[in-house]
């Protein structure tokens, strides 16, 4: 079988600080040394790239400096954290994994993690 399976949780609730974390796990058909992980957001049939990182197996994921994502890798598992989320960012976050090197290339796309973000209630003014 030449298909690469990607697993991720169905639902995650962001913290009150707008941070959501989830694990993206892939069943690698080959011995990849270079992997690219992309997080896509699907909402109202529109798809946008949230962030992407390429890493060498055994090394840390490096997202761009201005990225809202951070992550760590362990074997065929990537722990992704998305920060700065607000209620309007609620949506389906899909993990896409590409085994870039060595050949052959493999693509795997998860079913998505529905991230729910609830904006915190503003603190009432205190009379002191």
């Amino acid at each position: 079988c030449k298909a690469m399976h990607v697993a991720q949780p169905a639902v995650v609730l962001a913290s009150s600080r707008g941070i959501a974390s989830f694990v993206c796990e892939y069943a690698s058909p080959g011995k990849a040394t270079e992997v690219r992980v992309t997080v896509l957001r699907q909402a109202d049939s529109q798809v946008t790239e949230v962030c992407a990182a390429t890493y060498m197996m055994g090394n840390e994921l490096t997202f761009l400096d201005d990225s809202i994502c951070t992550g760590t890798s362990s074997g065929n598992q990537v722990n992704l954290t998305i920060q700065g989320l607000r209620a309007m960012d609620t949506g389906l976050y899909i993990c896409k994994v590409e085994l870039m090197y060595p050949p052959p290339y493999y693509l795997g796309i998860g079913n998505g993690t529905q991230i729910y973000v609830i904006d915190p209630e503003p603190c009432p003014d205190s009379d002191f």
Epitope: K2, A3, P29, L40, T54, Y101, P103, Y106, L107
Partner: antibody
Framework: QVQLVESGGGVVQPGRSLRLSCAAS????????IHWVRQAPGKGLEWVAV????????YYADSVKGRFTISRDNSKNTLYLQMNSLRAEDTAVYYC???????????WGQGTLVTVSS | EIVLTQSPDTLSLSPGERATLSCRAS?????LAWYQQKPGQAPRLLIY???SRATGIPDRFSGSGSGTDFTLTISGLQPEDFAVYYC?????????FGQGTKVEIK
């Protein structure tokens, strides 16, 4: 809107070289892999090569390996295909195509015709 | 490499009829696309992931199947649907296409 425009095709003798270009606009070029696909007259589609993101990772069809070189200039939003040691069987319309977020080729150029003939 | 075999090679139908095109893969894949190509034009993406319609594609086009057997169905052929259709796998290199099915007017 997303646009891909190929150029550089023409008539060339066997054994000679040709360089195709594909100018991209309407999207963040460096965030996508771009493929070359060709179609011989009256025939089906044949994948030729792909170059990913920052240009470090490239893949080629066996039929062109060692003769064709794919490259990209992300600062110019342009893809290239350097074709050396051309053969009659390389005669085809060459398309550049973007690998969309889900993987398939979601946007294609209009194609440029390469004719290898003496 | 994954070899894709399409059938039939040619399908002769009348406008309004239903077209059923088949694509069989030599190995299992989740990542199958369908393209439409008209003479003198570039291919156009119709279906990806075996069953998801690409942006702007009419709902008379539907894809189904999994593993090694896939189907493209056009329910109620319109005059503009007469063209050549290709399946493609994009889950692993090399990227491969089927040989195409021509849907022609009967």
């Amino acid at each position: 809107q997303v646009q891909l425009v190929e150029s550089g095709g023409g008539v060339v003798q066997p054994g000679r070289s040709l360089r195709l270009s594909c100018a991209a606009s309407g999207f963040t070029f460096s965030s996508y892999g771009i493929h070359w696909v060709r179609q011989a007259p009256g025939k089906g589609l044949e994948w030729v090569a792909v170059i990913w993101y920052d240009g470090r990772n490239k893949y080629y069809a066996d039929s062109v390996k060692g003769r064709f070189t794919i490259s990209r200039d992300n600062s110019k939003n342009t893809l290239y295909l350097q074709m050396n040691s051309l053969r009659a069987e390389d005669t085809a319309v060459y398309y550049c195509a973007r690998a969309g977020n889900w993987g398939p080729f979601d946007y294609w150029g209009q194609g440029t015709l390469v004719t290898v003939s003496s | 490499e994954i070899v894709l075999t399409q059938s039939p090679d040619t399908l002769s139908l009348s406008p309004g009829e239903r077209a059923t095109l088949s694509c069989r893969a030599s190995q299992s894949t989740n990542y199958l696309a369908w393209y439409q190509q008209k003479p003198g034009q570039a291919p156009r993406l119709l279906i990806y992931g075996a069953s998801s319609r690409a942006t702007g594609i009419p709902d008379r086009f539907s894809g189904s199947g999994s593993g090694t057997d896939f189907t493209l169905t056009i329910s109620g052929l319109q005059p503009e649907d007469f063209a050549v259709y290709y399946c493609q796998q994009y889950g692993t290199s090399p990227w491969t296409f089927g040989q195409g099915t021509k849907v022609e007017i009967k």
